[in-house]
């Protein structure tokens, strides 16, 4: 029958997931019930991505390792509509690092997904960045303008933010 | 294909000015950053100064203070007026460019390079 094979089908997905996750949170996508959109519990979920705070301090470099640890990449921001729900759960005291970073100290910034960098599609604070040798980049809170971007150096701990593609069972 | 156009080197006594010029055309949705680079004979290519598209602009220690890097969107083009030129600045200058060529393809884009001497 239909409707069994095709709850085989999510349970060994499910399976395949359970390794990084071992949990998720699904919901039915539009009104066909063959169609359900997951994120791992606790993440939470913006258009067709997840996202998760890693609230642990580190590296760049590590704050990545992490991320990819659980099928995930550091945060690639795209439109301001994504940065707006983003920062609804940041706290404004903290930093925390974007999957955007500047390898060569040449100011060509780089997507860790390899999304082209354009920078009319970016949301530096005023002034920034600044710095040849800051060459990764964190998102935080400054009371003249709100959130925006700064480049800082990689080595310094921050916190983080992990984005994923929705998982579709 | 993109094509960086250099002009404005020479030869300058110490002390004196330049201002070189670099204009991109082709086939370009926007440019990111774009910047000077220098090399010296028998030395590494360095970067010298860059600007982003809004502005912002970074330069080495050793010109801070009498470089000055500025662009003009509209026309593509990025300047570097060089003040209080000395021997240690010769080299030739190369322009680069961080090149949208659509909104999801990218160039790392370099001119030809102009000579500069700076000698009395």
């Known amino acids: 029958n239909f409707m069994y094979s095709k709850t085989v089908k999510r349970l060994s997905k499910l399976r395949e997931y359970q390794q990084y996750h071992p949990s998720l949170t699904c919901v039915m996508e539009g009104k066909d019930i063959e169609d359900w959109s997951c994120c791992p519990t606790p993440w939470t979920s913006f258009q067709s991505s997840c996202y998760f705070i890693s609230t642990g301090m580190q590296s760049w470099t590590k704050s990545q390792k992490n991320c990819s640890v659980m099928g995930a990449d550091l945060v690639v921001i795209n439109t301001r509509e994504e940065q707006d729900f983003i920062i609804q759960n940041l706290k404004r005291n903290s930093s925390y690092f974007l999957g955007l970073s500047d390898p060569g100290g040449r100011r060509h910034w780089q997507w860790v997904d390899q999304t082209p960098y354009n920078e009319n599609v970016t949301f530096w604070h005023s002034g920034e960045p600044n710095n040849l040798d800051e060459r990764c980049a964190i998102i935080n809170f400054r009371s003249s303008e709100e959130w925006g971007w700064n480049d800082i150096h990689c080595h310094v701990p921050q916190k983080s933010i992990c984005k994923m593609k929705k998982i579709y069972i | 294909q993109v094509q960086l156009q250099e002009s404005g080197g020479g030869l300058v006594q110490p002390g004196g000015s330049l201002r070189l010029s670099c204009a991109a055309s082709?086939?370009?949705?926007?440019?990111?950053?774009m910047g000077w680079y220098r090399q010296a004979p028998g030395k590494q290519r360095e970067l010298v100064a860059v600007?982003?598209?809004?502005?912002?602009?970074n330069y080495v220690d050793s010109v801070k203070g009498r470089f000055t890097i500025s662009r003009d969107n509209a026309k593509n083009t990025v300047y570097l007026q060089m003040n209080s030129l000395n021997p240690e600045d010769t080299a030739d200058y190369y322009c680069n460019a961080d090149v949208l060529l659509t909104f999801n393809k990218r160039e790392d884009s370099w001119g030809q390079g102009t000579q500069v001497t700076v000698s009395s």
């Open positions: 082709g086939r370009i949705f926007s440019i990111n950053a």
């Open positions: 600007i982003s598209r809004s502005g912002i602009s």
